[in-house]
């Protein structure tokens, strides 16, 4: 056996393996405090104890032991605001993107035992504490129930709930995925007196039905009311119930603004302003007009009033209202004025202050960059994130505006904290922003820190991923560059992942990873060790991600370029970028591939079928193939309606099937999960049918009973192994 040769430190590093990726060997941790006051928070420790922390007294103790958690197999918890009870969540069963059902147990912290009598039914679709005390609201079998105390009998608030027909307090499929982005549709008033909720009536919505094979003799059929483009939509109503005496008055319906109610519309969000003031946002089905309506409780008639002079209209003349969603208001202490992000006259999304009318709004931020999210408004400060710093759209820094000052002064809280390591932040604030946690996602190793809300001083490092740092020491990681390229009057930001021993004088295969959906962003300054990191590290492939027209945070001119014509500029801009990359001199023109998932699968398919000859091969995972097959709220936001008098022509022209002939000269791998509730298997079935009809050869793989994420461990392993083989074959890389 030959003796081991000593290698100096520099050469002992190894490349990433596919196994590393599939095992999650190099996954990172973040730390988000579960705030319970101005200076106190809870956190679940590594060993599953729920630990209480007080920042000011520095005390910490176990509030709920892992043995109590384990006794009911709990995976999550929630402390009641009066700190007397904790709900324990177990039997988690995923439904759609956000929704799941679970079993809930209530633990009495005073007595140290579970609450017996009037136990909660199972499985529950949603459960939450009131903001004050320990009232419980929950949704069971599409109806809302209320408990004044955990041991009390429940009071049934709604009776209309019916599976797949009427949903109370929880959204239906399309609202969950495309509008609310939550599993709930109920909101407590700040003092816990009122409970607002939405009723979704899906009775007239067409059903998507697909087989779930399981392991029985017969497959079962999954039925989901799912409105595709142009179909009948859910009918929504918003109600508010007085939870102090729910039986006395019953739920009161909140009126829809007249200008919205005159045609099909959506409810988009609800924000409690004070204990007797609520703000509702509505959107026309043609999603270029949004109305924010402020409603007040009138004691005399015990009714909710939404006067016309408290309706604020937001309209887009160049595209759709809002970004991906219409932004929500952040109200001031006066409970009348608010801050909101919307497009300024130059088409950049910025913070505006609305006191009386939108027309008289005062612009708070401005510039050729975008304000992205308002985290918190306090008496004297407003905290927000933006991509202003140094002009990189893919960064996120946190800023504080001192609103007490005149003019308001602005400070970047994060820009210079750990400049090399951290350029992409989010934040989590305690009550009244006395303290906050910063979570940095990269480009270096993620780090979570605790800060003083007055001085912004760092108090403590909460998580710095030391173990990950150590385990990466002996790994040859690729080099990541974020740069921009220009074409005509357009600027495209790109991220390039270069193999460890990259040499500009050599030629490398190129893989384009694309998403490209409206208001998305792929070029972000974040840390990641994933499949494409492996492809660069081990297989010597150059990876590039490009944000073309239609992507976010670079102004409405860039964003709205794709309005009513999806599938054109997103593809064109990927092709432009590839040509520019070839000009750089280190790309092997004969070995260029493209891959994408979901919207990215649509773009990669269209790019492969562009007839340019740029791509040798490509992969589409769970692609959309026609916007008529996708959800109404999403498709119509960007494409209008598939009707003759609206945009049917482009709906038809923009399908993957229409380009079937053009796949003849590329190697195409088409992949889809058969139980995809989001982008239905129908999309890939139709691509396959068109390719067969055109007598075009292609490769395909389906994943039985897998959804849009193809998330099961076995499926993920198979998927990435299969795609790796396909790419290596395409690029003539030895196994």
């Amino acid at each position: 056996r030959p003796s081991r040769v000593y290698k100096p430190e520099g050469n002992t590093k190894r490349a990433l393996t596919l196994k590393d990726i599939l095992n999650g060997t190099f996954s990172y941790k973040t730390y988000f405090p579960n705030w319970i006051s101005e200076q106190e928070y809870l956190h679940q420790s590594e060993d599953d104890n729920i630990v209480f922390y007080n920042i000011e007294t520095r005390e910490s103790y176990i509030i709920l032991s892992n043995s109590t958690m384990k006794s009911v197999n709990a995976t999550d918890y929630g402390l009641s605001p009066d700190r007397q009870f904790v709900y324990l969540e177990s039997d988690y069963s995923k439904l759609w993107r956000y929704s799941y059902t679970a079993t809930y147990y209530i633990y009495d912290l005073q007595n140290g035992e579970f609450v017996r009598g009037y136990e909660l039914p199972r499985p529950i679709q949603y459960l939450c504490w009131s903001p004050v005390g320990s009232k419980l609201a929950y949704v069971y079998q599409n109806n809302i129930y209320l408990k004044q105390r955990p041991g009390d009998p429940p009071f049934q608030i709604t009776y209309t709930g019916r599976e797949n027909r009427i949903f109370n307090g929880i959204p239906d499929w399309v609202y969950e995925e495309e509008m609310l982005a939550t599993k709930y549709a109920l909101w407590w008033s700040p003092d816990g007196k009122f409970l607002a909720y939405v009723e979704f009536n899906d009775s007239d919505i067409p059903i998507i039905a697909y087989s779930y094979y399981g392991d029985g003799q017969y497959p079962r059929t999954i039925n989901i009311p799912y409105p595709k483009a142009g179909a009948k939509n859910p009918v929504v109503r918003v109600f508010i119930v007085d939870t102090t005496y729910p039986h006395h008055v019953g739920p009161m319906e909140v009126p829809v603004p007249e200008m919205i109610a005159s045609s099909d519309y959506y409810f988009s969000w609800l924000t409690w302003v004070s204990s007797e003031r609520v703000c509702l946002q509505w959107l026309k089905r043609v999603q270029n007009v949004s109305v924010l309506s402020i409603c007040d409780f009138r004691e005399d008639w015990h009714a909710w009033e939404c006067p016309k002079n408290q309706e604020h209209v937001e309209e887009s003349r160049t595209g759709w209202a809002g970004g991906f969603f219409v932004s929500t208001p952040a109200f001031s202490q006066d409970a009348t004025s608010y801050y909101k992000i919307f497009s300024d006259k130059d088409g950049y999304k910025h913070i505006h202050y609305i006191k009386d009318t939108v027309e008289n709004a005062i612009q708070i931020t401005s510039g050729k960059w975008e304000a992205i999210y308002i985290f918190r408004v306090t008496q004297d400060s407003l905290f927000y994130s933006s991509n202003e710093f140094e002009g990189y759209p893919g960064r996120r820094n946190i800023y504080r505006i001192s609103i007490g000052n005149s003019p308001p002064s602005k400070k970047c809280v994060t820009c210079h904290l750990r400049k090399e390591r951290c350029q992409y932040y989010t934040a989590s604030f305690s009550y009244k922003a006395k303290y906050y946690a910063l979570v940095c996602y990269g480009p270096g190793l993620p780090i979570s820190t605790l800060h003083d809300g007055r001085t912004d001083q760092e108090i403590q490092v909460l998580e710095e991923n030391k173990e990950l740092e150590n385990s990466l020491r002996n790994i040859q990681l690729p080099k990541v560059e974020i740069k921009k390229l220009k074409d005509g009057g357009l600027t495209f930001w790109y991220k390039m992942i270069l193999p460890p021993q990259f040499d500009r004088s050599k030629k490398y295969p190129l893989l384009i990873q694309v998403y490209g959906g409206p208001c998305s962003q792929s070029v972000k300054s974040v840390f990641a060790v994933n499949w494409i990191t492996y492809l660069a590290s081990k297989e010597g492939i150059v990876i590039a991600l490009v944000d073309g027209r239609g992507t976010a945070f670079q102004g409405d001119k860039f964003l709205h370029a794709v309005y009513r014509k999806l599938g054109v500029y997103e593809v064109e801009d990927q092709l432009t970028a590839v040509r520019k990359f070839i000009e750089m001199g280190f790309i092997d023109e004969e070995r260029i591939a493209i891959w994408g998932w979901s919207y990215g699968g649509y773009v990669s398919s269209l790019a492969l079928a562009s007839g340019t000859g740029l791509f040798k091969c490509g992969i589409a995972v769970a692609p959309v193939s026609s916007w008529e097959y996708y959800a109404s709220i999403y498709s119509e936001r960007f494409m209008g309606l598939p009707t003759k008098d609206d945009n049917l022509e482009h709906y038809k022209n923009s399908t993957v099937m229409a380009r079937a002939e053009y796949f003849r000269n590329v190697d195409y791998l088409l992949i889809h999960g058969t139980a995809d509730d989001n982008v239905h298997f129908q999309n890939s079935a139709q691509i396959a049918k068109a390719l067969v009809n055109a007598q075009v050869d292609f490769q395909a793989m389906w994943y039985s009973d897998q959804n849009h994420g193809i998330l099961s461990g076995r499926s993920q392993n198979h998927l990435y192994t299969h795609m790796t083989h396909f790419l290596k074959q395409c690029f003539s890389l030895s196994d």
Epitope: G250, E305, C306
Partner: nanobody, 121 residues
Framework: EVQLVESGGGLVQPGGSLRLSCAAS??????????IGWVRRAPGKEEELVAR????????RYADSVKGRFTISCDTSKNTAYLQMNSLRAEDTAVYYC????????????WGQGTTVTVSS
């Protein structure tokens, strides 16, 4: 033009019953912005909202003085609201007005012409 027309008033003995009707025209009582109420005025007493209903949601509210005795309801097909008054007492004697209130603007209330209810033996 909005109109509210009440009917059903009259003389009744204590313990008796009456049903008041309020026929609305010019607006839709099943609209979520509409509340219908019965307001009574008696000499020397403060005006009192005895009951109100939001027909769209079926949400009802009663003054403590009539709780358990009066029932407010609506028939949206007839665009009419009702007040069923049982176990009437002498102190229920008053002119009963039907009032229509819009949740989109509380600056105005539509009123009917009123119907008199007299409870006396």
């Amino acid at each position: 033009e909005v109109q509210l027309v009440e009917s059903g008033g009259g003389l009744v003995q204590p313990g008796g019953s009456l049903r008041l009707s309020c026929a609305a025209s010019g607006f839709n009582i099943k609209d979520s912005s509409t509340y219908i109420g019965w307001v009574r005025r008696a000499p020397g007493k403060e005006e009192e909202l005895v009951a109100r209903i939001q027909c769209s949601a079926g949400s009802t509210r009663y003054a403590d003085s009539v709780k358990g005795r009066f029932t407010i309801s609506c028939d949206t097909s007839k665009n009419t609201a009702y007040l069923q008054m049982n176990s009437l007492r002498a102190e229920d004697t008053a002119v009963y007005y039907c009032a229509g209130r819009s949740a989109r603007s509380y600056s105005y209330i539509y009123w009917g012409q009123g119907t008199t209810v007299t409870v006396s033996s």
